[in-house]
Amino acid sequence: MMTGTIETTGNISAEKGGSIILQCHLSSTTAQVTQVNWEQQDQLLAICNADLGWHISPSFKDRVAPGPGLGLTLQSLTVNDTGEYFCIYHTYPDGTYTGRIFLEVLESSVAEHGARFQIP
């Protein structure tokens, strides 16, 4: 039975040209996290595997940085980065847990400041 829950940063906004940290946290389970996949819509951005560490997708390697922790840092944001992001926790023996984050990338003067996990 899957007892765990995923906490995420929820809906966040950031400035065009800036950076943002996407962060998820799995709690309420003793299941072992074997791998975390980060996806944007249908595209895989990065993998963090317990044995091998990070793999950043070739098409994102210049704009995505691993961490902190199991999180992911998106850099040089553009308006096209607006959308849903998913952290997919592969665990044993529970199975798969998925968290959702919605990122809105705004023009510099419009972006809200102080969003949790946002890099100034």
């Epitope: 074997t34 249908d42 595209q43 895989l44 044995d51 091998l52 793999h55 070739p58 798969t96």
Partner: antibody, heavy 120, light 107 residues
């Protein structure tokens, strides 16, 4: 040119161990992950595991956990795959193969294969 | 582990035919799928990576498509040297796994 040269055919008795080598040349050895794949006679391909030649980290398929050990020697640009407690079902051709980018990608360069026969 | 199911397991075709092989994953694997060609007694050869990217040196008659769970390898006009066995492989989640293979034979 880029190539992987594997050690020669082996005949082993059940319960014994075998160590297959794979020598890389023509590229920077530590920049590419290496996978091992086997193929039993008349059967399909079976992924065994992967090693990072740079740091030595490994990940093995559950089926082989506890029986397989993958290592590397950076001074000779060689990776090794040792399989212990051999049984007749381990009779197969064993291939090493270079991963083209990171660890989650296609295997673009393959060794010629090493035939391992397990027979009493 | 993610299961990869290929269909058909074998097919007969003639030179010049358009051939389609499908691969289905037991869960979504984004576009993290590779296709390989293997001829008897030889090591496999990478044809397609990332579901649709053609590996350097591979003829353009080979193409791949799909995302999520359903993928296709297409040979637009089968050539004599294309008679072989084709395998799909997912690299979305470790352990990476192969499909059972599709043998393309001469009709």
């Amino acid at each position: 040119q880029v190539q992987l040269v594997q050690s020669g055919a082996e005949v082993k008795k059940p319960g014994a161990s075998v160590k297959v080598s794979c020598k890389a040349s023509g590229y920077t050895f530590t920049s590419y992950y290496m996978s091992w794949v086997r193929q039993a006679p008349g059967q399909g391909l079976e992924w065994m595991g992967i090693i990072n030649p740079s740091g030595g980290s490994t990940s093995y398929a559950q089926k082989f956990q506890g029986r397989v050990t993958m290592t590397r020697d950076t001074s000779t640009s060689t990776v090794y795959m040792e399989l212990s407690s051999l049984r007749s079902e381990d009779t197969a051709v064993y291939y090493c193969a270079r991963v083209r980018y990171g660890y989650a990608d296609g295997m673009d360069v393959w060794g010629q294969g090493t035939t391992v026969t397990v027979s009493s | 582990d993610i299961q990869m199911t290929q269909s058909p397991s074998s097919l007969s075709a003639s030179v010049g035919d358009r051939v389609t092989i499908t691969c289905r994953a037991s869960q979504s694997i984004s576009s993290y799928l590779n296709w390989y060609q293997q001829k008897p007694g030889k090591a496999p050869k990478l044809l397609i990576y990332g579901a649709s990217s053609l590996q350097s040196g591979v003829p353009s008659r080979f193409s791949g498509s799909g995302s999520g769970t359903d993928f296709t390898l297409t040979i637009s006009s089968l050539q004599p040297e294309d008679f072989a066995t084709y395998y799909c492989q997912q690299v979305y989640h470790l352990p990476f796994t192969f499909g059972g293979g599709t043998k393309v034979e001469i009709k």
